[in-house]
Amino acid sequence: GYKAEVMVSQVYSGSLRVLNRHFSQDLTRRESSAFRSETAKAQKMLKELITSTRLGTYYNSSSVYSFGEGPLTCFFWFILQIPEHRRLMLSPEVVQALLVEELLSTVNSSAAVPYRAEYEVDPEGLVILEASVKDIAALNSTLGCYRYSYVGQGQVLRLKGPDHLASSCLWHLQGPKDLMLKLRLEWTLAECRDRLAMYDVAGPLEKRLITSVYGCSRQEPVVEVLASGAIMAVVWKKGLHSYYDPFVLSVQPVVFQACEVNLTLDNRLDSQGVLSTPYFPSYYSPQTHCSWHLTVPSLDYGLALWFDAYALRRQKYDLPCTQGQWTIQNRRLCGLRILQPYAERIPVVATAGITINFTSQISLTGPGVRVHYGLYNQSDPCPGEFLCSVNGLCVPACDGVKDCPNGLDERNCVCRATFQCKEDSTCISLPKVCDGQPDCLNGSDEEQCQEGVPCGTFTFQCEDRSCVKKPNPQCDGRPDCRDGSDEEHCDCGLQGPSSRIVGGAVSSEGEWPWQASLQVRGRHICGGALIADRWVITAAHCFQEDSMASTVLWTVFLGKVWQNSRWPGEVSFKVSRLLLHPYHEEDSHDYDVALLQLDHPVVRSAAVRPVCLPARSHFFEPGLHCWITGWGALREGGPISNALQKVDVQLIPQDLCSEVYRYQVTPRMLCAGYRKGKKDACQGDSGGPLVCKALSGRWFLAGLVSWGLGCGRPNYFGVYTRITGVISWIQQVVT
């Protein structure tokens, strides 16, 4: 029988250039008579153009919604009602070709053509893109607050904030022809729920979304976004009502930056330089294509690419890469943003070199990508360490912490977290190495203690990059490094002359001179520790709530013992900078560390002194008695303590803690506590120090109070941020 043909709406968006008209400011105001009259004429022309082609039978509706420079650019959308079976045949490319063909056919014609009555349309300036009904609805919702801006070369244009009576606004941005637009977004409030979406075209086409940002992101207080060309749209959707703009937008045209380079690497290991997407740290643009060719000096070496918060993964099937496509020696990989470091190691088999391509496969982009490149020895990629095949990183082997996600760095260890005697593979305690007393059968633990040794998991690396065998040699009063660097920066970790946490005891003045009280409006919120003249370390989760993210809220007290009174040794500071670890993840508590820069340097006294920071190789032995201090609640759910409390706890093996907490303990965590559970850190101690005393009498920072199940609960441990796991970031910031 007869079957009615199913018709579907196909939506197109686009722009065309009119050569015999000029753009004027009047055309930016939708309420102006110039705008109304120009849109009426342009709309008529557009309809006539479409209906002049074989698309005419499918024509449904159209609208010209905006104008721009060039001499005059019209921005429009139209809908065709087409039979379902013809849908794929009328792609934007086909529709564009039909319209261009029509325009070309009448360029030199003397016959009267309706759509040419008023306008001379440039066939080369016609652009047709795929759109959707949803896109048109989104566009229409912004038209009450539609701003067009043209930004000239060399100009930086600050955009006028949104109209707060509107719920949505659109900035339509245009720049000079062969340039690309760079948009800068700076969040100015600590908290908001506003949403901004940036598009690579004049309107909010979902398929051309570059990125969308939401709610005064603290992770990205400043975002720079690149369009692929000279046109861009930004759509704002209102969050909470606010009289202040929660953001500042500015735009500038920039020249296309070539992303091609040929490099020859030197005959040395480690990082030799940086490759990055154009205008890094700006988001890479939707049509980025980079090609880097690196030549390796010898087949002994492989090429290493070290990424920061970005990894490469094999993509199943042939799905597009949503966060950048990489091809390395004909292998296709997809980029993936992660809160971890990552390295890609490329074995070199031919002297021809290696070509690395990076492409943005879709319009959706992300933060610019930067990669450090260098060489590694193919026969020994990680001297003294273990190559983790999961992430390409060199990690300490057999130190009792599973640094590699698959745990292989802790497998097949003869001596785990201990020293292996040469004579008979006996495993002895690390503090017994180079302590002046032979513990191995023939004294191999006391050999090579005065000379450089190959670097390994527990060796200390001196400033001159040589390593010493003695574990934890820092600040013990005896220079072990040739350059004496193990005894530098040692004005730390000494208690003042001085004579609660759950099950704790009250501390005396000067007993814990590095202890900090982090306060908001006179209320103690978190603990912390002084680590340098202008730096206090604490837990990142103290700033988890948006309302706590602003530096102006915080006051840091040092030398404090009692919360309800002040004494002469006490000093207070404002915070000039607050830095959370870039890999901090709220849900998992991983990398739970933050640094506060004080507004002025501390003046050291008996009551105010920094704690010592451990080297990455510093080993805190399971079973070691250490101390936690703070003003946290004295019982679960209780009020904070008035007096600074102290309690000794014992360090616990990582795997035992990991079992108890069902494998949620990462390599950046450390566990301590008592089975009795009465002595443990509690709410309000967050960020406070876990310190361990070295044989030298100096106190080293082992951890920061991070999380745990309840408070002093039997059979559960307190979990701390492991300082040795984040020390490289701390040193990078502080120095």
């Epitope: 305690s429 399971p622 079973g623 990582q654 035992l656 009465k678």
Partner: antibody
């Protein structure tokens, strides 16, 4: 000085119960766990269970679950271990020990032991 | 439960000898191993915990070593008062378990 003093030897018939006491001095028993470990003649050591005298929370080795009850009286600093349904293989020296208060348990002080003989 | 297998079950040695007793755990116990000394008719005495740490008052001739699943107690120079039975214990996870013991006798 830390001391754990246990009650004297006992002779019991099969099926009966025995209750051994352990008086602590030189420390506060609320701050530690009190464990019980037994040793059959010429045999090794076998952990039976423990109590937290502060809140009477106890834990038992699966082998003794249901037959052993450990209690404590903090007013007298005394812990007790009762073993029921005695059989001849329960003949052993029973020790009370102080478990180090840390999360992992080793036994730093021991009572002198109480010999329990189960015989018909 | 974690099994602790001690060896040898007995050994004969002379005063001044270096003696080593070993203990193997059925799984990795991360250095959570204690050693005890027991003399006939007496209660055991704690010598070493956390594999290496000597308990208060224990002479320095007693030392512990090991990692993972394999642990050892060494008496560097055997003294007359050291003739006794020695036990290892894992303090990694409940139920706390002991090795079968090693009897050190005079040769």
């Amino acid at each position: 000085e830390v001391q754990l003093v246990q009650s004297g030897a006992e002779v019991k018939k099969p099926g009966a119960s025995v209750k051994v006491s352990c008086k602590a001095s030189g420390f506060n028993i609320k701050d530690y766990y009190i464990h019980w470990v037994r040793q059959a003649t010429g045999q090794g050591l076998e952990w039976m269970g423990r109590i937290d005298p502060e809140d009477a929370e106890s834990e038992y080795a699966p082998k003794f679950q249901g037959r052993v009850t450990i209690t404590a009286d903090t007013s007298t600093d005394t812990a007790y271990m009762e073993l029921s349904s005695l059989r001849s293989e329960d003949t052993a020296v029973y020790y009370c020990t102080r478990g180090d208060s840390m999360m992992v348990t080793y036994f730093d002080y021991w009572g002198q032991g109480t010999l329990v003989t189960v015989s018909s | 439960d974690i099994q602790m297998t001690q060896s040898p079950s007995s050994l004969s040695a002379s005063v001044g000898d270096r003696v080593t007793i070993t203990c193997k755990a059925s799984q990795d116990v991360s250095t959570a191993v204690a050693w005890y000394q027991q003399k006939p008719g007496k209660a055991p005495k704690l010598l070493i915990y956390w594999a290496f740490t000597r308990h208060t008052g224990v002479p320095s001739r007693f030392s512990g070593s090991g990692s993972g699943t394999d642990y050892a107690l060494t008496i560097s120079s055997l003294q007359p008062e050291d003739f006794a039975t020695y036990y290892c214990q894992q303090h990694y996870r409940s139920p706390w378990t002991f090795g079968g013991g090693t009897k050190v006798e005079i040769k």
